[in-house]
């Protein structure tokens, strides 16, 4: 990536890291308003299976692993990217390495959920306070989950699907910060590990993933009022280990693995028409990216 100053524009979709033949250090940003990609400052250490989020206008890259010809190291790292300076800086590491992690943000705090360290599949969850640069463990999930999808809705943290070390999962659970407890919610219709999970219009969407046999293109959404999962239109491509985010009322899915190919495809879902469309391609195919959108 280039080390020049990034243009000071809002509402970019950032994609960090990923995997193609080895873990990647790319940071790139897509501008949906004009369809352009920006090449930004590389991660200091390549990583895949990471998660991305934005707090206070800063982009955070959380966990993952560096799978390279020199070895394979799971990451406990938290790194912060400032779009105004186009620079990364390290923050306090998590208590344990977490590859194929999920993250969510509540009240400016980052929740790191599940993931793996070697063959240990975590059910542990920890919360980061940016003002203090500190991590603290909170209540563990009821289920060990890697490749878990995480989303926040109405100040509740949802952990969806994943892999517990033996089985891919259709189960989902919800964390109540005030009570510091997890409760199971209605299971998805489909087993999904490595799905893309996000929130749009008061629903939690789970897109794609892997069911233990095949990559999926199906998409379902959870209505918190009715506590039911309902299928919506499928994506054009089957994909697991995809990136996902929401931008101006639409869902964007980025890359992933279809069982044969590392996808460069970026699809966009319009809930008004219940349709997916191909909107752009990443500069190269990859899986296991961390994705987030800058705030206004």
């Amino acid at each position: 990536g280039s080390m020049g100053h990034a243009p000071k524009v809002g509402r970019l979709i950032y994609t960090a890291g990923g995997y193609f033949r080895q873990s990647l250090s790319y940071l790139e940003a897509y501008n949906p308003s004009d369809g352009t990609w920006l090449d930004l400052a590389d991660l200091q250490v390549p990583r895949s299976g990471l998660a991305g989020c934005v707090v206070g206008g800063l982009l955070y890259a959380v966990g993952g692993r560096n799978n390279s010809p020199d070895g394979n190291t799971d990451s406990s790292a938290l790194d912060c990217y400032n779009p105004m300076t186009n620079q990364w800086s390290p923050c306090a590491p998590m208590s344990v390495p977490r590859n194929r992690i999920g993250v969510g943000v509540i009240d400016g705090h980052i929740y790191a959920v599940g993931g793996s360290h070697g063959c240990i599949h975590h059910n542990s969850v920890e919360r980061y306070e940016p003002e203090r640069d500190e991590w603290h463990l909170v209540a563990p999930m009821l289920t060990r989950r890697i490749g878990v999808g995480v989303a926040v809705l109405n100040r509740l943290l949802y952990a969806v699907g994943g892999f517990d070390g033996t089985n891919r999962l259709n189960s989902a659970e919800c964390y109540y910060p005030e009570r510091n407890e997890w409760r199971m919610i209605t299971a998805m219709n489909t087993i999904r590990s490595g799905a893309g999970v996000c929130v749009l219009h008061n629903c939690i969407y789970a897109a794609g993933g892997y069911d233990g046999q095949d990559q999926l293109n199906s998409v379902e959404r959870y209505d918190v009022e009715t506590e039911t999962w309902t299928f919506v239109a499928p994506m054009k491509h089957r994909r697991s280990a995809l990136g996902i985010t929401v931008h101006q009322g639409r869902i964007y899915v980025l890359g992933g693995y279809d069982g044969h190919t590392f996808l460069d495809s970026v699809e966009c879902y319009d809930p008004d028409t219940d349709t997916w469309s191909e909107v752009t391609r990443m500069t190269s195919g990859r899986s296991g990216v961390g994705v987030a959108v800058t705030m206004e």
Partner: antibody
Framework: EVQLVESGGGLVQPGGSLRLSCAAS????????IHWVRQAPGKGLEWVAS????????LYAKSVAGRFTISADTSKNTAYLQMNSLRAEDTAVYYC??????????????WGQGTLVTVSS | DIQMTQSPSSLSASVGDRVTITCRAS??????VAWYQQKPGKAPKLLIY???SLYSGVPSRFSGSRSGTDFTLTISSLQPEDFATYYC?????????FGQGTKVEIK
């Protein structure tokens, strides 16, 4: 019945290349992580490479990293090991094996019969 | 890399004997250890996974146990078909590593 059948071994000169195939039947390779393990003549077992069916990520032993490439074609239900820049010390019987869960607690429950690779001038 | 030190490298035993093979990991590997049996010219066969779980179809005379970083394969009453080489394997951390093998021969 679950079966793995390797092919593609043979005699090759140092610096040469070979592509090994592992044809699976009785199960879908898309549902398993596939591993290659080798055994030099009269020696023990050495893990070589693996591919994860969910993420597509591959792992390699340091001794082969940068020279060997593992891949899978789910439409043919076959895994491959492309071996380049071969050395005398790569001489071994190469086995493919499946692991039904991709975590470390699972083990390799089915193995192929092996294919012999000899690197010699 | 985690080293799996297997002992003995070979042993002689008679049919009906109780045989114990040990593998010591150079660091913690939890219970992520498997045991395999290999006969000359053949592929390895899985006996034990997760340190102590007997794989389907394997005779109950085979058992595995763990004590810290020490792992043991026991054959309670050796049968003629058990004369072979046995390997332990750790899959706790990358890269997966095998013990050097124990050859069980007829006394």
């Amino acid at each position: 019945e679950v079966q793995l059948v390797e092919s593609g071994g043979g005699l090759v000169q140092p610096g040469g290349s070979l592509r090994l195939s592992c044809a699976a039947s009785g199960f879908a390779i898309s549902a398993s992580s596939i591993h290659w393990v080798r055994q030099a003549p009269g020696k023990g077992l050495e893990w070589v490479a693996s591919i994860d069916p969910e993420t597509g990520e591959t792992l390699y032993a340091k001794s082969v990293a940068g020279r060997f490439t593992i891949s899978a074609d789910t439409s043919k239900n076959t895994a491959y090991l492309q071996m380049n820049s071969l050395r005398a010390e790569d001489t071994a019987v190469y086995y493919c094996a499946r692991r039904t869960a991709s975590d470390g607690r699972a083990a390799m429950d089915y193995w192929g019969q092996g294919t012999l690779v000899t690197v010699s001038s | 890399d985690i080293q799996m030190t297997q002992s003995p490298s070979s042993l002689s035993a008679s049919v009906g004997d109780r045989v114990t093979i040990t593998c010591r990991a150079s660091q913690s590997v939890s219970s992520a250890v498997a045991w395999y049996q290999q006969k000359p010219g053949k592929a390895p066969k899985l006996l034990i996974y997760s340190a102590s779980s007997l794989y389907s179809g394997v005779p109950s005379r085979f058992s595995g146990s763990r004590s810290g970083t020490d792992f043991t394969l026991t054959i309670s009453s050796l049968q003629p078909e058990d004369f072979a080489t046995y390997y332990c394997q750790q899959s706790y951390s990358f890269p997966s590593t095998f013990g050097q093998g124990t050859k069980v021969e007829i006394k």
